[in-house]
Interface confidence: low
């Protein structure tokens, strides 16, 4: 067989679907790899071919096309299943040629199957709601294609396994779920259930995502820094431990990155000769405020360590704050004991 | 753990409230059902309230029985209208996750007789 | 309403013996499905839930098969303490009814 451009396993398109529901899955070639769509590869002449390996087996197979009621099929460059089975589970791939062209990419399609729940291994997209933020709305995801804008369909929206009527703050709006003041009790996995009709059979697609509360931008503040304080003096002796926590609470804000870093005399620990170490931690609120604590530790400080401007710094998309530790030399206490017994002598 | 209390003779027409009390169970983490079953007869499923605080009943007790949180570690069941078929045990029950559906940890049951 | 019909109402089998029981809903309701086991006096135990998954301290002689509107228990190797009633429960909810309700029993005697 002549030279195929073969782009391998796109493992990154790990594309899932429930056992006993339609899938439809476009040929990834047109989405990721080639630069021109499948109607111009069309009508440049070139054919688009399905086969496929099943689970567990290493023969590449044709894909049976020919099922009773075109259980599967092919639609331009889309592949059809009208309902999955379980068995469908393998490495499919789609290649597009002619005489003296060709390209292909396999993808892995795993059919799931869902407990009653909606519980099942899908990877679950995470949708964030700002907290108490006024009317949010998720959309029920990944139904577009499935059925033409005359078919009105049935959707049901689900909380775990509770169908959402008569909730306090959540309304069902056809494919929308708004929340009315979303709330930490609103965290949880949501599933919305589309029901439609086609050539005289029920077809079902569940959709399950989570959604997760977090801190509003209402509420949102540059950097705190906690620790180091005007209140807390590191006072060593050399050949001492020197520990010193930089503790940094930052508001959560979508998709900012949140910094955290020492300067010793104003440079980076990295650059300078001193035997530092950083241990970093990281906790979060349950609305994904995040607190995060580098402490920088010298084993064995010396009087020129404790001379040093030890600074913390932080920065958000908020804004950058900064602020210098109090380190001090401890005096050496004063030798009591000898001067008690003289002034004891003297009397 | 999982009790009951509250059962007793009334006589028909008079509410009752059945209390469940939990202990070591996070009620924010787990559904909990109530289950009757009349003398000498099988299972039968009241409801159950899911971790997020809403009541979901079986068809044939809408209106008579409601199930709500009373605390963090109460769960009670409030029946009117009883007449002498709610004679049974009732059972309350750990859901075995927020809204599973199957009951992994079971009370002892307590009685409620109805009769005039 | 959604209807839960379990047979049979009693089955004796001696000791070592198998004993199936059949469970039937009255619609689809996937693998929502729980089986228990009652002894007289006690409430019931939990066995299987989602029609084949044995609940924890359950022996591996209980197993659960099907899916949809036909089930089955299958208790192997009887020992007398397996002498009890044994009740299907449907733990399936959609939207027009809520899930919840039991057979109406199995009574096992091990002779």
């Known amino acids: 067989s002549e030279r195929c451009d073969d782009w391998g396993l796109d493992t990154m398109r790990q594309i899932q679907v429930f056992e006993d529901e339609p899938a439809r899955i476009k040929c990834p070639l047109f989405e990721h790899f080639l630069k021109f769509n499948y109607s111009t590869a069309h009508s440049a002449g070139l054919t688009l071919i399905w086969y496929w390996t099943r689970q567990d087996r290493d023969l590449e197979e044709p894909i049976n096309f020919r099922l009773p009621e075109n259980r599967i099929s092919k639609e331009k460059d889309v592949l059809w299943f009208r309902p999955t089975l379980l068995n469908d589970t393998g490495n499919y791939t789609c290649m597009l040629r002619n005489t003296t062209y060709c390209s292909k990419v396999a993808f892995p399609l795993e059919v799931v199957q869902k407990d009653s729940c909606f519980n099942s291994p899908m990877k679950l997209p995470v949708h964030k709601l700002y907290i108490e933020y006024g009317i949010q709305r998720i959309t029920c995801p990944n139904v577009d294609g499935y059925f033409p804008s005359s078919v009105k369909p049935t959707i049901t929206w689900y909380m775990g396994c509770y169908k959402i009527q008569n909730f306090n703050n959540v309304i069902p709006e056809g494919m929308n779920l708004s929340f009315l003041i979303a709330l930490i009790s609103n965290n949880g996995n949501y599933t919305c259930v589309v029901t439609y009709p086609e050539n005289g059979r029920t077809f079902h697609l569940t959709r399950t995502l989570t959604v997760k509360v977090v801190g509003s931008p209402k509420n949102a503040v540059p950097p705190v820094i906690h620790s180091p304080n005007d209140h807390v003096v590191y006072e060593k002796e050399p050949g001492e431990e020197l520990l010193i926590p930089c503790t940094v609470y930052f508001s959560f804000l979508m998709d900012s990155r949140n910094e955290v870093w020492w300067t010793i005399d104003g440079k980076k620990p990295d650059d300078i000769t001193i035997d530092v170490t950083i241990n970093e931690s990281i906790s979060h609120s349950r609305t994904e405020d995040e607190t995060r604590t580098q402490i920088l530790s010298i084993k064995k400080v010396t009087s020129e360590d404790l001379k040093r401007s030890y600074v913390c710094h932080a920065r958000s998309a908020k804004g950058e704050v900064a602020k210098a530790a109090k380190v001090k030399q401890k005096v050496p206490a004063p030798r009591y004991t000898v001067e008690l017994a003289c002034g004891f002598g003297a009397t | 753990s999982v009790e009951e209390s509250g059962g007793r003779l009334v006589t028909p027409g008079t509410p009752l409230t059945l209390t469940c009390t939990v202990s070591?169970?996070?009620?924010?983490?787990?559904?909990m059902g109530w289950v009757r079953q009349a003398p000498g007869k099988g299972l039968e499923y009241i409801g159950v309230?899911?971790?997020?605080?809403?009541f979901y009943d079986a068809s044939w007790a809408k209106g008579r029985f409601t199930i709500s949180k009373a605390s963090s570690t109460t769960v009670d069941l409030k029946m009117t209208g009883l007449t002498p078929e709610d004679t049974a045990t009732y059972f309350c029950a750990r859901d075995r996750g927020t809204s599973t559906g199957s009951l992994d940890l079971w009370g002892q049951g307590t009685l409620v007789t109805v009769s005039s | 309403a959604l209807v839960m019909t379990q047979t049979p109402a009693s089955v004796s089998e001696p000791v070592g013996g198998t004993v199936t029981i059949k469970c039937q809903a009255s619609e689809n309701i996937g693998n929502g499905l729980a089986w228990y086991q009652q002894k007289p006096g006690q409430p019931p135990n939990l066995l299987i839930y989602g029609a084949s998954t044995l609940a924890s301290g359950v022996p591996s002689r209980f197993s659960g098969s099907g899916y949809g509107t036909e089930f089955t228990l299958t208790v192997s190797d009887l020992e007398s303490g397996d002498a009890a009633t044994y009740y299907c429960q449907c733990t399936y909810w959609n939207p027009d009814y809520i899930g919840g309700a039991f057979g109406g029993g199995t009574e096992v005697v091990v002779t």
């Open positions: 070591g169970i996070d009620l924010d983490n787990y559904a």
């Open positions: 309230i899911s971790s997020d605080g809403f």
